[in-house]
């Protein structure tokens, strides 16, 4: 699996998550988020510069799981990538 990283962007808060998703040699076509304890995936919205955002009416519950589809057709899923108590500006890589 090529290297993937998730950077929590400025502006993220308990009801808004903005994540820059980088995938070695590829670009995200679709990113989905799943909160801790949930079975359902929700679509994130693509912003500028590879930043994907999600807005919630209720406080978001981490750690956060992601699945994505890239422009080249790669599909992957990563559990517990961004911790519940994340740091703005921090870059998280899936645990190996």
């Amino acid at each position: 699996v090529p290297k993937v990283t998730f950077t929590v962007e400025k502006g993220s808060n308990e009801k808004h998550l903005a994540v820059l998703v980088k995938y070695e040699g590829d670009t995200m076509a679709e990113v989905e988020l799943r909160e801790h304890g949930s079975d359902e995936w929700v679509a994130m919205t693509k912003g500028e510069g590879g930043v994907w955002t999600f807005d919630s009416e209720e406080p978001l519950q981490g750690p956060f799981n992601f699945r994505f589809l890239t422009e080249k057709g790669m599909k992957n899923v990563f559990d517990d990538v961004v911790p519940e108590k994340y740091t703005i500006g921090a870059t998280y890589a899936p645990e190996e």
Epitope: V1, D39, W41, V77, P94
Partner: antibody, heavy 114, light 105 residues
Framework: LESGPGLVKPSQTLSLTCTVS??????????WSWVRQPPGKGLEWIGN???????YYNPSLKSRITMSVDTSKNHFSLRLTSVTAADTAVYYC??????????WGQGTLVTVSS | ELTQSPSSLSASVGDRVTITCRAR??????LNWYQQKPGKAPKLLIW???NLQSGVPSRFSGSGSGTEFTLTISNLQFEDFASYYC?????????FGSGTKLEIK
């Protein structure tokens, strides 16, 4: 590649292991899955596990199943307790990319009989 | 829950056949199709409703979104006689349809 006993007695525990080749479970990016198929019937999803140990189980089987993963041996396992004849099936292990089941083992027949 | 129809279907080489899968509630486009031949493991054909898996012949196509999905095989070939299953990945709790057995008329 699935491995385990082909015959299990009623009320006992079915244990299967799937050894993954061609990649490391530890590298992430996938769920590791079990699916079964009773003779002449359709496919039934049993559950998924992530390399960290997170599990997702079929609600109808949840009380009887345990999935685990051993990254050092690059394998994952299934335990199904209190088996009956209804658990007789071909058991498949598979890889899921979060969207599909894109790679499957060849399957192993487990018969529950005394 | 996924409801697949028909449960069995007879057709001839060269025919065009359609198999339907219905979801109880919307699953967006997170619906996959698999082919299974006797004694073999299932094989992924179509992912996310309409995307052809690499190596699968173009006579297979999928469509639909929400609650209704179809798998179409045009110009049926002898090797296409098999069982077909739909599967949803809208949630982490996957489910399969009950299957469709495609037989030679």
């Amino acid at each position: 590649l699935e491995s385990g006993p082909g015959l299990v007695k009623p009320s006992q525990t079915l244990s299967l292991t799937c050894t993954v080749s061609g990649g490391s479970i530890r590298s992430g990016g996938y769920y590791w899955s079990w699916v079964r198929q009773p003779p002449g019937k359709g496919l039934e999803w049993i559950g998924n596990i992530y390399h960290s140990g997170n599990t997702y189980y079929n609600p109808s089987l949840k009380s009887r199943i345990t999935m685990s993963v051993d990254t050092s041996k690059n394998h994952f396992s299934l335990r199904l307790t209190s088996v009956t004849a209804a658990d007789t099936a071909v058991y498949y292990c598979a890889r899921s990319d979060g969207y599909t089941l894109d790679n499957w083992g060849q399957g192993t027949l487990v018969t529950v009989s005394s | 829950e996924l409801t697949q129809s028909p449960s069995s279907l007879s057709a001839s080489v060269g025919d065009r056949v359609t198999i339907t899968c219905r979801a109880r509630q919307s699953i967006s486009t997170y619906l996959n199709w698999y082919q299974q031949k006797p004694g073999k493991a299932p094989k992924l054909l179509i992912w996310s409703a309409s995307n052809l898996q690499s190596g699968v012949p173009s006579r297979f196509s999928g469509s639909g979104s929400g609650t209704e999905f179809t798998l179409t095989i045009s110009n049926l070939q002898f090797e296409d006689f098999a069982s077909y299953y739909c599967q949803q990945s809208y949630t982490t709790l996957y489910t399969f349809g009950s299957g469709t057995k495609l037989e030679i008329k």
